[in-house]
Amino acid sequence: IWELKKDVYVVELDWYPDAPGEMVVLTCDTPEEDGITWTLDQSSEVLGSGKTLTIQVKEFGDAGQYTCHKGGEVLSHSLLLLHKKEDGIWSTDILKDQKEPKNKTFLRCEAKNYSGRFTCWWLTTISTDLTFSVKSSRGSSDPQGVTCGAATLSAERVRGDNKEYEYSVECQEDSACPAAEESLPIEVMVDAVHKLKYENYTSSFFIRDIIKPDPPKNLQLKPLKNSRQVEVSWEYPDTWSTPHSYFSLTFCVQVQGKSKREKKDRVFTDKTSATVICRKNASISVRAQDRYYSSSWSEWASVPCS
Amino acid sequence: RNLPVATPDPGMFPCLHHSQNLLRAVSNMLQKARQTLEFYPCTSEEIDHEDITKDKTSTVEACLPLELTKNESCLNSRETSFITNGSCLASRKTSFMMALCLSSIYEDLKMYQVEFKTMNAKLLMDPKRQIFLDQNMLAVIDELMQALNFNSETVPQKSSLEEPDFYKTKIKLCILLHAFRIRAVTIDRVMSYLNAS
């Protein structure tokens, strides 16, 4: 058993049918010695008396808010949560496996630049009695500071019969140098509590590996005289690290017909302009990627050919 | 990345082309190592990230773009002496460059070159003959060092009398390649920045 926060405790259980469970001793936080009784949750049934209460915690029915009283007055509370270990592996019931970029990916994180700011998000089908708390650091043995905000519900979508909820959090490394070469990964730890179930999820990454630039901005077309060709131009996104000559991007320019089946013409360039043939009803899209470190491409920025 | 890449024209900052070749070569070598050594811990998540140049060179600090010198987190031990030799820059651009930066890059390359050559000698003794260092990568390191044109005493190749542990050598190769790829990215950024200056 360990303390998650004041008066909230996590009991770790080897989870299998007929498991013996864990013996837990609760102590009433009071100078009183006599006339103390214990109850669980809203029940008035007295579970025991005395300053300490010994219980065998086996299942969720044994978890909850234990309260000690004296003469009708509440003295203190202890909330017991359960953390299930199933055959040597901590349970992952609360969050959905996003399966991207690989199986068992519960937390996904992205950064728009090298400033040390990043966003993580996760998915769940649970809509109520759910709380998250997020901590982060650079490295684990001698951790350096990363500050995270509160996790917030950022999207809701319907998937088949189920509703899916997306939560996200923004974090910022306390003293980040955009040009630094990372040797210690960022660690992100999310504590999830659903009713009386506790779970924790972690992700470990280098900022350089989670970079995904914003799409190029100010995408414009300039027709070339007496030609089907157009000059496409764009700019680096505002959120990208500066100076751009140091943090350079490379670009992919795509001409896509109205039909998805039509052949796509693609050009790769390090410049912020390109000359392409603009077909009728086609659209021109441009996306960006770090020129020197192949992390994710940005989403496409698009303009119609007409 | 199999993209069409424009070849820089000869008027460009001469080291830019070499540094781009370096990054391509080390990235290819790392990809080859990951595939060949699939049963070894060779991915970024599995290896310890060690920097053999730590406390010996200061490339990131020495080559920091002027725009980032206002960022206190970037200023660990920045020294600001300006370039006095090295042939990478045309003379009119010399004043924009710090000697420490290019010499630091040169020292990095020299240290990695020695490590890679020592390692290759060990890998050649492996009865499995599983993996060797790409000669192209070693040649590209050499070309960039020559383009930098710094005079520095040669570091003797380390020789080891004891029987090599090939498992450890292959893991060390992965660690080295990961670190060298990261340094090659920094070198490319620096060259691109200097080229634009």
């Epitope: 080897d14 989870w15 299998y16 055959d87 199986n103 068992k104 | -």
Partner: antibody
């Protein structure tokens, strides 16, 4: 004590269907994940499928994906394996088992796919 | 498609020490716990070892398990006639959990 009693096995022609059941008692069935494991005659153990305690997630071996469906009825304390498009290579003893560091197995039920 | 490899058979005389190896990789045994099962003819498998080296109550202490890196082993110290059976190791793969990965199985024969 924990008990898993299996039923539903038998002889079936290729291409036909069969449903296996596993009745649980002696524990809170709705709190635990469950597996199906099979063993072809004279061969080793092969995992078939898994279902979460609440039925929310199901996992299958590639060899049965799209043909077999694992399900559970927590109100009846019963686990099921619906097998469709059966093939000769599905001939095996099928076991249900609880998920956990200490596990309990059903007695097994023989499924024979033969024309 | 077994990824946990065991020797097909091992044998020993009563009282001898018999060991069965189970060889895997970084993503399975290297990252997860190992179990060992004993299966007597015509019966369901019985758990002998969980969590690499733990014995459930009721399992004789002549059975012991260990794990090192990407391999595990089961030792029977002082093998007895009633130990003649098939033995299977089991683990998980970190990418496909909760799918059970079973070893190829080892037939233990007690001679004499």
């Amino acid at each position: 004590q924990v008990q898993l009693v299996q039923s539903g096995g038998g002889v079936v022609q290729p291409g036909r269907s069969l449903r296996l059941s596993c009745a649980a008692s002696g524990f809170t069935f709705s709190s635990y994940g469950m597996h199906w494991v099979r063993q072809a005659p004279g061969k080793g153990l092969e995992w078939v499928a898994f279902i979460r305690y609440d039925g929310s997630n199901k996992y299958y071996a590639d060899s049965v994906k799209g043909r077999f469906t694992i399900s559970r009825d927590n109100s009846k304390n019963t686990l099921y394996l619906q097998m469709k498009s059966l093939r000769a290579e599905d001939t095996a003893v099928y076991y249900c088992k609880t998920h956990g560091s200490h596990d309990n197995w059903g007695q097994g039920t023989m499924v024979t796919v033969s024309s | 498609s077994y990824v946990l490899t065991q020797p097909p058979s091992v044998s020993g005389t009563p009282g001898q020490r018999v060991t069965i190896s189970c060889s895997g990789g970084r993503s399975n045994i290297g990252s997860n716990t190992v179990k060992w099962y004993q299966q007597l003819p015509g019966t369901a498998p019985k758990l002998l070892i969980y969590n690499n080296d733990q014995r459930p109550s009721g399992v004789p202490d002549r059975f012991s398990g260990s794990k090192s890196g990407t391999s595990a082993s089961l030792a029977i110290t002082g093998v007895q006639a009633e130990d003649e059976a098939d033995y299977y190791c089991q683990s998980y793969d970190r990418g496909t959990h909760p799918a059970l990965l079973f070893g190829t199985g080892t037939k233990v024969t007690v001679l004499g």
